[in-house]
């Protein structure tokens, strides 16, 4: 259960399948009737530098089936993998095997999941067992976090702090797991 499911998943990578599966049809409730006006969390801005594009982070898409015990999702899901180190955007192409890695001379910058989203999945089970419905937590975006010399690997620091977030603004995708508690697990997973 929990993140153990991620580490123990029988992951099947499916090349050349770039689109998200169709979400299941809306249930009988009309969600839009119940939305907070302009609701949602504003986008997360981890960099409080003058030029936000100064640093970049690799986001690689991959597609896989998710499993829960012996059960497997009826359709594959597509998510991101946050890969490698962070560096100046101009030196860090968003693809594997091209360009040079930027090596920071100061603190170490790490590319980790920033936000997550929920996706409904139906899991088909063997032996006539009833199908299961779950909501899987998928990586939706990545960000650079800084490791300072005063903190160990599990103490990843944001470039800046976030201000209060009222439910106003653009509609973002949901968010990240705790770097403090889960960085080791994320590194194992990715």
């Amino acid at each position: 259960q929990g993140w153990q499911a991620f580490k123990n998943d029988a992951t099947e990578i499916i090349p050349e399948l770039g689109e998200y599966p169709e979400p299941p049809p809306e249930l009988e409730n009309n969600k839009t009737m119940n939305r907070a006006e302009n609701g949602g969390r504003p986008p997360h801005h981890p960099f409080e530098t003058k030029d936000v594009s100064e640093y970049s982070c690799r986001e690689l898409h991959f597609t896989r089936y998710v499993t829960d015990g012996p059960c497997r999702s009826a359709k594959p899901v597509t998510e991101l993998v946050c890969s490698g180190q962070c560096g100046p955007a101009r030196l860090l192409p968003n693809a594997i095997g091209r360009g040079k890695w930027w090596r920071p001379s100061g603190p170490d910058f790490r590319c980790i999941p920033d936000r997550y989203r929920a996706q409904r999945v139906q899991l088909l089970c063997p032996g006539g067992e009833a199908p299961r419905a779950r909501k899987v937590r998928l990586v939706a975006s990545c960000k650079c976090k800084r490791l300072t010399r005063f903190h160990n690997q599990s103490e990843l620091k944001d470039f800046g702090t976030e201000a209060a977030r009222p439910q106003k603004g653009r509609k973002p995708r949901p968010r990240a797991r705790s770097a403090k508690a889960n960085q080791a697990e994320l590194e194992n997973a990715y």
Epitope: K31, Y116, R117, A118, A130, R132, A133, K135, R175, A181
Partner: antibody, heavy 121, light 109 residues
Framework: EVQLVQSGAEVKKPGASVKVSCKVS????????MHWVRQAPGKGLEWMGG????????IYAQKFQGRVTMTEDTSTDTAYMELSSLRSEDTAVYYC??????????????WGQGTLVTVSS | QAVVTQEPSLTVSPGGTVTLTCGSS?????????PYWFQQKPGQAPRTLIS???DKHSWTPARFSGSLLGGKAALTLSGAQPEDEAEYYC?????????FGGGTKLTVL
């Protein structure tokens, strides 16, 4: 382990507003899907609204539309629920509840201790 | 808004088996309603027993199980204990909007 600590009991007059806070520890607020549930004395649980991670929006129960506002202060990892135009039937214990940040979304796994709001003239 | 219905009260003998059900005014309850079951004792906050129809939590005693039964969500308690006397609530997910049932008062007698 997610822990939620709510603000203390409040007594309000009809027509006033109340703002209940819910402080998150163990994780950061933005990692979690926070919901608010209330329970009037001797009555059942009633979902008021919460954050829907499928599309990154806060949804409010129809009954509370226009009267409730759910906000967050991520600098202090504190969620707030403000209910306005209070009436006597809003007297209830108000709970915040959140998921456990696992691989599968499981909502309402962790609950605050509850905040009693009494509306009386 | 949908209405979620539960038995107002049920009684079970110690060691006995009882099934609590949860229906929806909109039709049959399915796995896509992600049924939840909560236990609440007097003066305490609720605690989750079952998520997503049948998924138990680390703290859920083995004697509790969740399922779908005849178009309803069901919580079965096999081998009831005195400490299982409590109020039980189901919760259904209507596409991101949640609705609680009215609760079932379970007496172990």
């Amino acid at each position: 382990e997610v822990q939620l600590v709510q603000s203390g009991a409040e007594v309000k007059k009809p027509g006033a507003s109340v703002k209940v806070s819910c402080k998150v520890s163990g994780y950061t607020l933005t990692e979690l899907s926070m919901h608010w549930v209330r329970q009037a004395p001797g009555k059942g649980l009633e979902w008021m609204g919460g954050f829907d991670p499928e599309d990154g929006e806060t949804i409010y129960a129809q009954k509370f539309q226009g009267r409730v506002t759910m906000t967050e202060d991520t600098s202090t990892d504190t969620a707030y629920m403000e209910l306005s135009s209070l009436r006597s039937e809003d007297t209830a214990v108000y709970y915040c509840a959140t998921d456990s940040a696992g691989y599968w979304y499981k909502f309402f796994q962790h609950w605050g201790q509850g905040t009693l709001v009494t509306v009386s003239s | 808004q949908a209405v979620v219905t539960q038995e107002p009260s049920l009684t079970v003998s110690p060691g006995g088996t009882v099934t609590l059900t949860c229906g929806s005014s909109t039709g049959a309850v399915t796995i896509d309603h992600y049924p939840y079951w909560f236990q609440q004792k007097p003066g305490q906050a609720p605690r989750t027993l079952i998520s997503d129809t049948d998924d138990k939590h680390s703290w859920t005693p083995a004697r509790f199980s969740g399922s779908l039964l005849g178009g309803k969500a069901a919580l079965t308690l096999s081998g009831a204990q005195p400490e299982d006397e409590a109020e039980y609530y189901c919760l259904l997910d209507y596409g991101g909007t949640f609705v609680f049932g009215g609760g079932t008062k379970l007496t172990v007698l």
